[in-house]
């Protein structure tokens, strides 16, 4: 058993049929010695008396808010949460496996630039009685500071018969140099509590590996005389690291109709303009990627050909 | 500790081309190592990230773009002095700081070159003959060093009398390639910045 935060404790349980469970001793936070009774949650049933209460925690019915009282007055609370371990593996029931980039990916993180700011998000089908707490650091043995905000519900989607909820959090490395060469990864730890179930999820990455630039901005078209060709130009996104001659991007320019199956024109360039063939009812799209370290491509920025 | 704005004219910067070749060569070699050594811990997640140039050179700090010198987090640098007579310095206006940057890059390349050559000698003794260093990568390191053209004492190639542990050597190769790729990215960024300034 360990303390998650003040008056909240996590009991780690091997979860299998007829498991013996864990013996837990609760101590009432009071100078009083006599006349103390214990109850669980809203029940008025007295579970025991005395300054300490010893319980055998085997299942969720044994978890919850234990309260010690004296003469009708509440002295203190202890909330017990369960963390299940099945076949030596901690449960991952609360969050959905996003399966990208690989199986057992529960947390996904992205950074728009090298400033040390990044966003992580996760998915769940649970809508109520759910809380998250996020911590992060650079390295684990001698951790350097990363400050994370509160996790917030950022999107709701309908998937078949189910509703899916996306939560996200923004974090910022306390002293980040955009030009630095990372040797220690960022560690992100998410504590998830659903009702009386506790789970924790972690992700470890280098900022350079989670870079995904914003789409290029200010796309403009200029038809070329006596030609089917169009010159398309754009600018670096505002959120990209500067100077741009140091943090350079490369671009993919594509002309395609509404359907992915339609024919297309495609060209890659390090410049902020390109010449392509425009077709009626097609769009010109441009996306960006770090020129020297191939992490993710940005989303497309698009303009219609006409 | 930072790059000046007054740097060579665009067409006069021979090192840009060589640094692009370097990044390409090390990336290809790393990809080859990951594929060939698929049953060894050779991915970014599996290896320890070590920098053989740590406390010996200060490339990131010495080559910091002017715009980042206002960022306090970028300025916790180690002071290092280098000889300054490189041929990539195509302009007399080139400052001492730029020379410091380029000589730091030269020292990095020299250190990695020695490590890679020592390692290749060991890998050539492996009865499995599983992986060797790409000669193209070694040639590209050499070309960039020649383009930088700094005078510096030659570092003797490390020779080891004991029987090499090939498993350890291959893991060290992965560590070295990962670190060198990251340094090659920095070098490419620096050359691009200098070329554009």
């Amino acid at each position: 058993i360990w303390e998650l935060k003040k008056d909240v404790y996590v009991v780690e349980l091997d979860w299998y049929p007829d498991a013996p469970g864990e013996m837990v001793v609760l101590t009432c936070d009071t100078p009083e010695e006599d006349g103390i009774t214990w109850t669980l949650d809203q029940s008025s049933e007295v579970l025991g008396s005395g300054k300490t209460l010893t319980i055998q925690v085997k299942e969720f019915g044994d978890a919850g808010q234990y309260t010690c009282h004296k003469g009708g007055e509440v002295l203190s609370h202890s909330l017990l949460l369960l963390h299940k371990k099945e076949d030596g593996i901690w449960s991952t029931d609360i969050l959905k496996d996003q399966k990208e980039p690989k199986n057992k990916t529960f947390l996904r993180c992205e950074a728009k630039n090298y400033s040390g700011r990044f966003t992580c998000w996760w998915l769940t089908t649970i809508s109520t009685d759910l809380t998250f707490s996020v911590k992060s650091s650079r390295g684990s043995s001698d951790p350097q500071g990363v400050t994370c905000g509160a996790a917030t519900l950022s999107a709701e989607r309908v998937r078949g018969d189910n509703k899916e909820y996306e939560y996200s959090v923004e974090c910022q490395e306390d002293s980040a140099c955009p030009a630095a060469e990372e040797s220690l990864p960022i560690e992100v730890m998410v504590d998830a509590v659903h009702k009386l179930k506790y789970e924790n999820y972690t992700s470890s990455f280098f900022i350079r590996d989670i870079i995904k630039p914003d789409p290029p901005k200010n796309l403009q078209l200029k038809p070329l005389k006596n030609s089917r060709q169009v010159e398309v130009s754009w600018e670096y996104p505002d959120t990209w690291s500067t100077p741009h001659s140091y943090f350079s991007l490369t671009f993919c320019v594509q002309v395609q109709g509404k359907s992915k199956r339609e024919k297309k024109d495609r060209v890659f360039t390090d410049k902020t303009s390109a010449t392509v063939i425009c077709r009626k009812n097609a769009s010109i799209s441009v996306r960006a990627q770090d020129r020297y370290y191939s992490s993710s491509w940005s989303e497309w920025a698009s303009v219609p050909c006409s | 500790r930072n790059l000046p704005v007054a740097t060579p004219d665009p067409g006069m910067f021979p090192c840009l081309h060589h640094s692009q070749n370097l990044l390409r060569a090390v990336s290809n070699m790393l990809q080859k190592a990951r594929q060939t050594l698929e049953f060894y811990p050779c991915t970014s997640e599996e290896i320890d990230h070590e920098d053989i140039t740590k406390d010996k050179t200060s490339t990131v700090e010495a080559c910091l773009p002017l715009e980042l010198t206002k960022n306090e987090s970028c300025l916790n640098s180690r002071e290092t002095s280098f000889i300054t007579n490189g041929s990539c310095l195509a302009s007399r206006k080139t400052s001492f700081m730029m020379a410091l940057c380029l000589s730091s890059i030269y020292e990095d390349l020299k250190m990695y070159q020695v490590e890679f050559k020592t390692m290749n000698a060991k890998l050539l003794m492996d009865p499995k003959r599983q992986i060797f260093l790409d000669q193209n990568m070694l040639a590209v390191i050499d070309e960039l060093m020649q383009a930088l053209n700094f005078n510096s004492e030659t570092v003797p190639q490390k020779s080891s009398l004991e029987e090499p542990d090939f498993y350890k050597t291959k893991i060290k190769l992965c560590i070295l390639l990962h670190a060198f790729r990251i340094r090659a990215v920095t070098i490419d960024r620096v050359m691009s910045y200098l070329n554009a300034s």
Partner: antibody, heavy 118, light 107 residues
């Protein structure tokens, strides 16, 4: 499967014209760009131009501008390349090639040998 | 127009050996570079597109790399059916242009 079948070999006199055909099958004809590439005996490949069968748009290499015409007949899924004012150095194998992507060639015809000789 | 130069013109390699073919562009073409194989009496066949992207059905021994002005096609272990002429082609700008080809012959 996607296939391009070209017309047979031709022998032409200098100054004449030649029209080579390329019949497509195994895909919707208007879904692919169509290019013409030639190869002189013992020489490399030379791109001549492209046509979009969907709308008849064309782009020709400057070298052939004014001397080449590329057309398509969507009813028969056939593309045509006509080269005028033939010279002896136009002797080559002429290939049609197609792709959903404009700038490279995924599927090739078997080639048509055009000999220009007096 | 962009001029593509391939080297060497002829490459003599023993079966099972590695072959490295080079292609250089007269100006930077990013990764707009494609590789083809042509056997005598046959049409060319696309091997690699956009410098390094592999094509389904093409053996994994064929790989491409490079960007900017310098590109490489590598055949990791030559098989008898790989002896042919190889062409690179740029798609950075029109007119599309090919290299002069590299003939890979049996040593």
């Amino acid at each position: 499967q996607v296939q391009l079948v070209q017309s047979g070999a031709e022998v032409k006199k200098p100054g004449a014209s030649v029209k080579v055909s390329c019949k497509a099958s195994g895909y919707t004809f208007t879904d692919y760009y169509l290019h013409w590439v030639r190869q002189a005996p013992g020489r490399g490949l030379e791109w001549m131009g492209w046509i979009d069968p969907e709308n008849g748009d064309t782009e020709y290499a400057p070298k052939f501008q004014g001397r080449v015409t590329m057309t398509t007949d969507t009813s028969t899924s056939t593309a045509y390349m006509e080269l005028r004012s033939l010279r002896s150095d136009d002797t080559a194998v002429y290939y049609c090639a197609a792709n959903k992507e404009l700038r490279y060639f995924d599927v090739w015809g078997q080639g048509t040998m055009v000999t220009v000789s007096s | 127009e962009i001029v593509m130069t391939q080297s060497p013109a002829t490459l003599s390699v023993s079966p099972g050996e590695r072959a490295t073919l080079s292609c250089r562009a007269s100006q930077s073409i990013s990764i707009n570079l494609h590789w083809y194989q042509q056997k005598p009496g046959q049409a060319p066949r696309l091997l690699i597109y956009f410098a390094s992207q592999s094509i389904s059905g093409i053996p994994a021994r064929f790989s491409g790399s490079g960007s900017g002005t310098e590109f490489t096609l590598t055949i990791s272990s030559l098989q008898s059916e790989d002896f042919a002429v190889y062409y690179c082609q740029q798609s950075n700008s029109f007119p599309l242009t090919f290299g002069g080809g590299t003939k890979v012959e049996i040593k």
